[in-house]
């Protein structure tokens, strides 16, 4: 289809991407599915500038991003290289902690209350952020 020049209604434009910020919670996989059904993906943070933008909009609330290590190495959902890319982990994180008693370790990354990242149990119902590139975004999405 033809490229779009503005973000869908209720999405926020920033640096040629469109962002949607949830106000309720889902497990990581369910949040991922939500974004996909919107022709988007969980947010991929590629710079300190983007980190600050997202952090400003989500506030001090645990919020999923598009980063996980469910299949071994850490991977961004859009294929962005993790090893050479931007990172903002809390000290001592990620730690794949098993002490939560929920079974398994911690395979999904989220923004913490101070914006830095932590790995946590993917089933926790956190808020999330969807992102889509501006030239892929529709102009008039459903009202949310």
């Amino acid at each position: 289809g033809s490229e779009r020049t503005c973000c869908p209604v209720n999405w926020v434009e920033h640096e040629r991407s469109c962002y949607w910020f949830s106000r309720s919670g889902k497990a990581w996989a369910d949040a991922d599915n939500y974004c996909r059904l919107e022709d988007a993906h969980l947010v991929v943070v590629t710079s300190w500038e983007e980190q600050k933008f997202v952090q400003h909009h989500i506030g001090p609330v645990n919020t999923w991003m598009g980063l996980h290590d469910q299949n071994g190495p850490w991977k961004w959902v859009d294929g962005t290289d993790y090893e050479t890319g931007f990172k903002n982990w809390r000290p001592e994180q990620p730690d794949d902690w098993y002490g939560h008693g929920l079974g398994g370790g911690e395979d999904c990354a989220h923004f913490t209350d101070d914006g830095r990242w932590n790995d946590d149990v993917c089933q926790r119902p956190y808020r999330w952020v969807c992102e889509t590139e501006l030239d892929k975004a529709s102009q008039e999405p459903p009202l949310l």
Epitope: N10, K26, L37, D39, E140, P141, L144
Partner: antibody, heavy 120, light 107 residues
Framework: EVQLLESGGGLVQPGGSLRLSCAAS????????MSWVRQAPGKGLEWVSA????????HYADSVKGRFTISRDNSKNTLYLQMNSLRAEDTAVYSC?????????????WGQGTLVTVSS | DIQMTQSPSSVSASVGDRVTITCRAS??????LAWYQQKPGKAPKLLIY???SLQSGVPSRFSGSGSGTDFTLTISSLQPEDFATYSC?????????FGQGTKVEIR
């Protein structure tokens, strides 16, 4: 006024195929995810499949995965459901439903449905 | 899959009655719950979403509540046009699933 009109239902033998269509009007079709939901006689509602605005992402109920294919043509404001390898248990009224709130997904408008009967 | 179980399966009531329908999820659904009304031969109508948000145009006698796995639809004063089948739906996880329906009949 939002309208969803299904067509393509009918009687088909087990193992056969049908293609359902849903013609949409009264809203900007290309900006909403869409779903198919079915209701077997005397039974409750069952979600069948969903498709994203562009058609690039799809989801299916396990009961139809590998047999049914959802698609859409935004230039024609039409949603489709290709149904292959039909079984008796697929007998139901099939309705298309519009996503009202993004990928939530709650359905704020539904079609009246088209009856699919699978019988020999 | 998340199973949605409604009770009762049917209820007989009179105009003006308060009617309560419950829906129980087999696991937590993070408040991703909707209620629909369906009349014979008609398309379902969205009444409530997000547990308690009233869809535009739906009368205020309909209300929803609950959290976790247990949810309730209440009709505060039943009207003649409310005799129908009511279904809950979870939208937390694929596959989205519905309750089996509760038929509200005239006593």
């Amino acid at each position: 006024e939002v309208q969803l009109l299904e067509s393509g239902g009918g009687l088909v033998q087990p193992g056969g195929s049908l293609r359902l269509s849903c013609a949409a009007s009264g809203f900007t079709f290309s900006t909403y995810a869409m779903s198919w939901v079915r209701q077997a006689p005397g039974k409750g509602l069952e979600w069948v499949s969903a498709i994203s605005r562009s058609g690039g992402n799809t989801h299916y109920a396990d009961s139809v995965k590998g047999r049914f294919t959802i698609s859409r043509d935004n230039s024609k404001n039409t949603l489709y459901l290709q149904m292959n390898s039909l079984r008796a248990e697929d007998t139901a009224v099939y309705s298309c439903a519009k996503d009202g709130f993004g990928g939530s997904s709650y359905f704020d408008y539904w079609g009246q449905g088209t009856l699919v009967t699978v019988s020999s | 899959d998340i199973q949605m179980t409604q009770s009762p399966s049917s209820v007989s009531a009179s105009v003006g009655d308060r009617v309560t329908i419950t829906c129980r999820a087999s696991q937590g659904i993070n408040n991703w719950l909707a209620w629909y009304q369906q009349k014979p031969g008609k398309a379902p109508k969205l009444l409530i979403y997000g547990v308690s948000s009233l869809q535009s145009g739906v009368p205020s006698r309909f209300s929803g509540s609950g959290s976790g796995t247990d949810f309730t639809l209440t009709i505060s004063s039943l009207q003649p046009e409310d005799f129908a089948t009511y279904s809950c739906q979870q939208a937390n996880s694929f596959p989205w699933t519905f309750g089996q329906g509760t038929k509200v009949e005239i006593r």
